[in-house]
C-alpha cells in the first residue's frame, strides 16, 4: 500500500481541518487507513480520524479541532494497520479555507433594487469574522451569456443591484463565497445558490 499524493490539509479556522490525499490504487479508506493527529503542545493526546473515500483512489478526513490560534502546529501520521505510510505536519493558520457563507436570500420587494443578503459563517469572537470579503456570482439560466461576479469588499454581508441592470421576465440565480485577506486564505466553497424571478419593469416614461 502506497501514498500517491501526500495529504494536503486546509482549516476552516474554527473547528475542522480537512485533509485529502490519493492512494496508489483502489482503497477502502475507512476500513484500511487511519490519520492520527496531535497538537504540538504540553500534554496533548493523539487523536484519530477515520477517512472516507473520495473517488476510487482518493481519501478525505475531517479532523475535529478546538479553536485555532496562529501558534498551533499538528503532527500527522497516516497508518495502514501497523504500517506508517506517511508522516507530516500541518499549521492550520497557514492553510485556511473559510467556511461558505449561508442563508443567501434575495429580497425583490425593495423598489428598483434587488437586495441580496447572507450570513457570515463565523461567530463574532472568531478572528475571521471581521476579515471576510465576498464574491457574489449572479447568472441566468435563461440567458447563458449572462454571468457576473460582484466583489463585496466591505464587511456587511449585503449586495444591492439596480433591478434595471437585469433583464425583466427571466429567472436569475446567485451564490456567494468568502475569503479573508489578512489570513491569506483560499476562497471558500460557493454557498448553495438561490433563485428569483426578475419581474421589474421600467416606468413607462423611461422606456
Amino acid at each position: 500500500m502506497k501514498v500517491l499524493q501526500e495529504p494536503a490539509c486546509v482549516s476552516d479556522y474554527m473547528s475542522i481541518s480537512t485533509c485529502e490525499w490519493k492512494m496508489g490504487g483502489p482503497t477502502n479508506c475507512s476500513a484500511e487507513l487511519r490519520l492520527l493527529y496531535q497538537l504540538v503542545f504540553q500534554s496533548s493526546e493523539t487523536h484519530t480520524c477515520v477517512p472516507e473515500n473520495n473517488g476510487g483512489v482518493g481519501c478525505v478526513c475531517h479532523l475535529l479541532m478546538d479553536d485555532v490560534v496562529s501558534m498551533d502546529n499538528y503532527t500527522l501520521d497516516l497508518w495502514a494497520g501497523q504500517q506508517l505510510l506517511w508522516k507530516g505536519s500541518f499549521k492550520p493558520s497557514e492553510h485556511v479555507k473559510p467556511r461558505a457563507p449561508g442563508n443567501l436570500t434575495v429580497h425583490t420587494n425593495v423598489s428598483d433594487t434587488v437586495l441580496l443578503t447572507w450570513s457570515n459563517p463565523y461567530p463574532p469572537d472568531n478572528y475571521l469574522y471581521n476579515d471576510l470579503t465576498y464574491a457574489v456570482n449572479i447568472w441566468s439560466e435563461n440567458d447563458p451569456a449572462y454571468s457576473r461576479i460582484h466583489n463585496v469588499t466591505y464587511l456587511k454581508p449585503t449586495l444591492r443591484i439596480p433591478a434595471s441592470t437585469l433583464k425583466s421576465g427571466i429567472s436569475y440565480r446567485a451564490r456567494v463565497r468568502a475569503w479573508a485577506q489578512h489570513y491569506n486564505t483560499t476562497w471558500s466553497e460557493w454557498s448553495p445558490s438561490t433563485k428569483w424571478y426578475n419581474s421589474y419593469r421600467e416606468p413607462f416614461e423611461q422606456r
Epitope: 497538537l39 504540553q42 500534554s43 496533548s44 493526546e45 479541532m65 478546538d66 496562529s70
Partner: antibody
C-alpha cells in the same frame, strides 16, 4: 469534593527505591494530566514530572531523568512515581497535583488547581 | 529551558496596604491572545501550595478578589489590593507553557 491523597514516602538509603502513590477522587481522573512537584527542606518548589491523561505523554526534570518513572492506573484513579537510585538531594516533600484537561485536542489549562497533602521522602544513610 | 525570576524575595507589608510581586520569564509565555501560561501559587506555613491565579490573570475558584494577576509575554505581576494577616506565606510564579515547568524562587510575604 475533588481530592488527592499521597502515600509511600519514608526513609530510604542512598541507592534505594521508593514508590509514591497519589489517589484521586471527585473528578474524571483519566481526562486530566497529572504532575509531581517536590520541595526540599527550606527550599522552593521544583517540578519533577508530568503525565498526560492517557499516560502516552511523559515528561521529566533533568535531575530525575533515568531514575524516576511516572505512571498512572486510570482504572484505579491512581498516579505513581517510582523512585530508583535515590540520592540525598531527592530528600523532599513530594506533592501530586491535578494538571490540564488533556482529553481535548488542545489541552485546557486551569492551573495546578488541586494538590495533595504531600508525602515526605528522606534519603539518608 | 525557561527560567522564572521573582522579585522581591522578601516583602514586609502593613495590613490594609497593597502589595505587588514581579515575575520575569526568559521566554514569552504568550501562546494565544490573552493566554499567558503563568500561574501564581501561595504556600502557607506547613501547608500544600494553593492556586491563586492561572493563565496570567484568571482567579482560581474561591480566591478573594483582592488578588489579581496581570502582564503578558515575559513580565508578570501579582497584586494584592489590601493585604490581610491570612495572606502571609510564600508566593511562587510558575510557567506552564511547556515542560520543564519552572517556578520562581518564591517571595516571602510577612506582616510588618
Amino acid at each position: 469534593e475533588v481530592q488527592l491523597v499521597e502515600s509511600g514516602g519514608g526513609l530510604e538509603q542512598p541507592g534505594g527505591s521508593l514508590r509514591l502513590s497519589c489517589a484521586g477522587s471527585g473528578f474524571t481522573f483519566r481526562d486530566f494530566a497529572m504532575t509531581w512537584v517536590r520541595q526540599a527542606p527550606g527550599k522552593g518548589l521544583e517540578w519533577v514530572s508530568s503525565i498526560s491523561g492517557s499516560g502516552d505523554n511523559i515528561y521529566y526534570a533533568d535531575s530525575v531523568k533515568g531514575r524516576f518513572t511516572i505512571s498512572r492506573d486510570n482504572s484505579k484513579n491512581t498516579l505513581y512515581l517510582q523512585m530508583n537510585s535515590l540520592r540525598a538531594e531527592d530528600t523532599a516533600v513530594y506533592y501530586c497535583a491535578k494538571d490540564r484537561l488533556s482529553v481535548t485536542v488542545r489541552p485546557r489549562y486551569y492551573g495546578l488547581d488541586v494538590w495533595g497533602q504531600g508525602t515526605t521522602v528522606t534519603v539518608s544513610s | 529551558d525557561i527560567v522564572m525570576t521573582q522579585s522581591p524575595l522578601s516583602l514586609p507589608v502593613t495590613p490594609g496596604e497593597p502589595a505587588s510581586i514581579s515575575c520575569r520569564s526568559t521566554q514569552s509565555l504568550l501562546y494565544s491572545i490573552g493566554k499567558n501560561y503563568v500561574d501564581w501559587y501561595l504556600q502557607k506555613s506547613g501547608q500544600s501550595p494553593q492556586l491563586l491565579i492561572y493563565l496570567g490573570n484568571n482567579r482560581a475558584t474561591g480566591v478573594p478578589d483582592r488578588f489579581s494577576g496581570s502582564g503578558s509575554g515575559t513580565d508578570f505581576t501579582l497584586k494584592i489590593s489590601r493585604v490581610e494577616a491570612e495572606d502571609v506565606g510564600f508566593y511562587y510564579c510558575m510557567q506552564a507553557l511547556t515542560t520543564p515547568y519552572a517556578f520562581g524562587q518564591g517571595t516571602k510575604l510577612e506582616i510588618k
